[in-house]
């Protein structure tokens, strides 16, 4: 009778996470008697996966019917595979012994690799908004994938970006991996409607990449432009001055009118007009009773946008019974001291 051989026909098996893995093993003889055991890994630290003789192994089923009397097939199936199950599995024949069974012969081993899908990419932008012409960073993260090979691309409005850096961790062997990428994006005034996309391709995705998105509207702040003008009025003792606040984003805006440096009225922008590029416009007006003023008046439109330092523009309103000409406007940062009439 030829000596028993342990045959593991497959050097490697690849299984998708969540599926069952079948590990094949056959004996060439029924003799010598003794249990078949399956281990993950070799040496002293090996992990028992299945023992034919005894024990409870809820995830393991035998491929061949256990009650076959001449069974030489000791293949097993492991259910609900996770990346943690990856490793080399050995089918080991033990010879009956006293008091303990003795390892007799081992199969060559079957390497189980687990294909695990990456998690949905999560894209996050900068913590604070930036203005056009500045560069902001977006990060993309995905976890839990295996094998390690993965491709990540960045797009802005469908155009591929090149300024990014990507790391896959850990660098060595692991049951699963994570990817982290940072892209640098230069903001433009038209980016309120723009979107950045992080696209991940992996063998488990079968050509259908995962995408994570972020809107640049969360990252951009477009400061407003101000224009103060006087509108014609029928009544000679009244002047109508308007402040046109244009092309700002986001919405949050507070406007204060000052007459010769003194606060006349404060209002919060409510009914805004949205432009095609996603920015907003707003207009505020101020009625000035010219009779109440002997001298010329400097009217200042002061705007605080998105919690930033206020910007303002002033308009010199000439008080003259016969003259209705408009004064020049002046732009200032922050609060303005009263402006002398032009």
């Amino acid at each position: 009778e030829d000596e028993l051989q342990v045959i593991q026909p497959e050097k490697s098996v690849s299984v998708a996470a969540g599926e069952s893995a079948t590990l094949r093993c056959a004996m060439t003889s029924l003799i010598p008697v003794g249990p078949i055991m399956w281990f993950r890994g070799a040496g002293a630290g090996r992990e028992l996966i299945y023992n034919q003789k005894e024990g409870h192994f809820p995830r393991v089923t035998t491929v061949s019917e256990l009650t076959k009397r001449n069974n030489l097939d000791f293949s097993i199936s492991i259910s609900n595979i996770t990346p943690a199950d990856a490793g080399t599995y050995y089918c080991v024949k033990f010879r009956k012994g006293s008091p303990d069974d003795v390892e007799f012969k081992s199969g060559a081993g079957t390497e189980l690799s687990v294909r695990a899908k990456p998690s949905a990419p999560v894209v996050s932008g900068p913590a604070v908004r930036a203005t056009p012409e500045h560069t902001v960073s977006f990060t993309c993260e995905s976890h839990g994938f295996s094998p390690r090979d993965i491709t990540l691309k960045w797009f802005k409005n469908g155009n591929e970006l090149s300024d990014f850096q990507t790391n896959v961790d850990p660098a060595g062997d692991s049951v699963s991996y994570s990817i982290h990428s940072t892209a640098r994006v230069v903001l433009t005034r038209g980016d309120v409607h723009s979107q950045v996309i992080c696209e991940i391709a992996h063998i488990t995705l079968q050509g259908d990449p995962l995408r994570g998105t972020a809107n640049l509207s969360e990252a951009i702040r477009v400061p407003p432009t101000l224009e103060v003008t006087q509108q014609p009025m029928r009544a000679e003792n009244q002047a109508n001055v308007t402040c046109q606040v244009s092309n700002f984003y986001p919405r949050g805006l507070q406007l204060t009118w000052l007459e010769n440096g003194n606060v006349s009225r404060t209002e919060t922008a409510s009914t805004l007009i949205e432009n095609k590029d996603g920015t907003y416009n707003w207009m505020s007006w101020l009625l000035v009773n010219t009779c109440a003023h002997r001298d010329d008046v400097v009217l200042t439109c002061q705007v605080e946008h998105d919690g930033q330092q206020a910007v303002s523009k002033s308009y010199a309103l000439e008080i003259s019974a016969h003259q209705k000409e408009h004064g020049s406007d002046i732009t200032h940062e922050a609060a303005l001291a009263p402006t002398a009439p032009l």
């Epitope: 029924l30 010598p32 005894e54 256990l66 009650t67």
Partner: antibody, heavy 120, light 106 residues
Framework: EVQLLESGGGLVQPGGSLRLSCAAS????????MSWVRQAPGKGLEWVSA????????YYADSVKGRFTISRDNSKSTLYLQMNSLRAEDTAVYYC?????????????WGQGTLVTVSS | SYELTQPPSVSVSPGQTASITCSGD??????ACWYQQKPGQSPVLVIY???KRPSGIPERFSGSNSGNTATLTISGTQAMDEADYYC?????????FGGGTKLTVL
């Protein structure tokens, strides 16, 4: 309590047929292989045939191969042995025996036996 | 085909130790089982996997198996142990029995 109860034995002429039954109770019948073992008068035990728990695998001693057929009905927890072309040397008490499990099982339970006599 | 050989008979005095042997080629590489059969009764399993006793079998029954020989040992033999004993190789598709040994308690 495990119980195995054979029936169907009797006197039959050479060349005739008999069907033995073994009604099982007290265990999950489909989880165990079952066997027929016979014992001729004044002689030792002779294994005849075995069947796996599902019924998918059957085994026979050379002395009965081609003449006997083992089968089981797991829904009825019953084991059968169809014996055709009976010969005088098939005369014996036929025991139904349960395998003890999946790891080198002995016969851990036996029925009381049913006598088959083949004689003209 | 595989064959197992047993002595036809063994005699022992009450209280003494009885040993029944079972020989087969490299039997030590296989598992041996032993059955006890009293007259007019069905066989009863007394030893399996060489040395193990099923529940209900007295401790005086023990087994060993190495080389070409398996041995059933009954220590402190009692009159009720008088019976036929059969060895079996519990490892293959065909269950091979020995010819049986009649144990007489004198």
């Amino acid at each position: 309590e495990v119980q195995l109860l054979e029936s169907g034995g009797g006197l039959v002429q050479p060349g005739g047929s008999l069907r033995l039954s073994c009604a099982a109770s007290g265990f999950t019948f489909s989880s165990y292989a079952m066997s027929w073992v016979r014992q001729a008068p004044g002689k030792g035990l002779e294994w005849v045939s075995a069947i796996s728990g599902s019924g998918g695998d059957t085994y026979y001693a050379d002395s009965v191969k081609g003449r006997f057929t083992i089968s089981r009905d797991n829904s009825k927890s019953t084991l059968y042995l169809q014996m055709n072309s009976l010969r005088a040397e098939d005369t014996a008490v036929y025991y139904c025996a349960k395998d003890g499990g999946s790891y080198y099982p002995p016969f851990d339970y036996w029925g009381q036996g049913t006598l088959v006599t083949v004689s003209s | 085909s595989y064959e197992l050989t047993q002595p036809p008979s063994v005699s022992v005095s009450p209280g003494q130790t009885a040993s029944i042997t079972c020989s087969g080629d490299k039997l030590g590489d296989r598992y041996a089982c032993w059955y006890q059969q009293k007259p007019g009764q069905s066989p009863v399993l007394v030893i399996y996997q060489d040395t193990k006793r099923p529940s209900g079998i007295p401790e005086r029954f023990s087994g060993s198996n190495s080389g070409n020989t398996a041995t059933l040992t009954i220590s402190g033999t009692q009159a009720m142990d008088e019976a036929d004993y059969y060895c079996q190789a519990c490892d293959s598709s065909t269950a091979v029995f020995g010819g049986g040994t009649k144990l007489t308690v004198l």
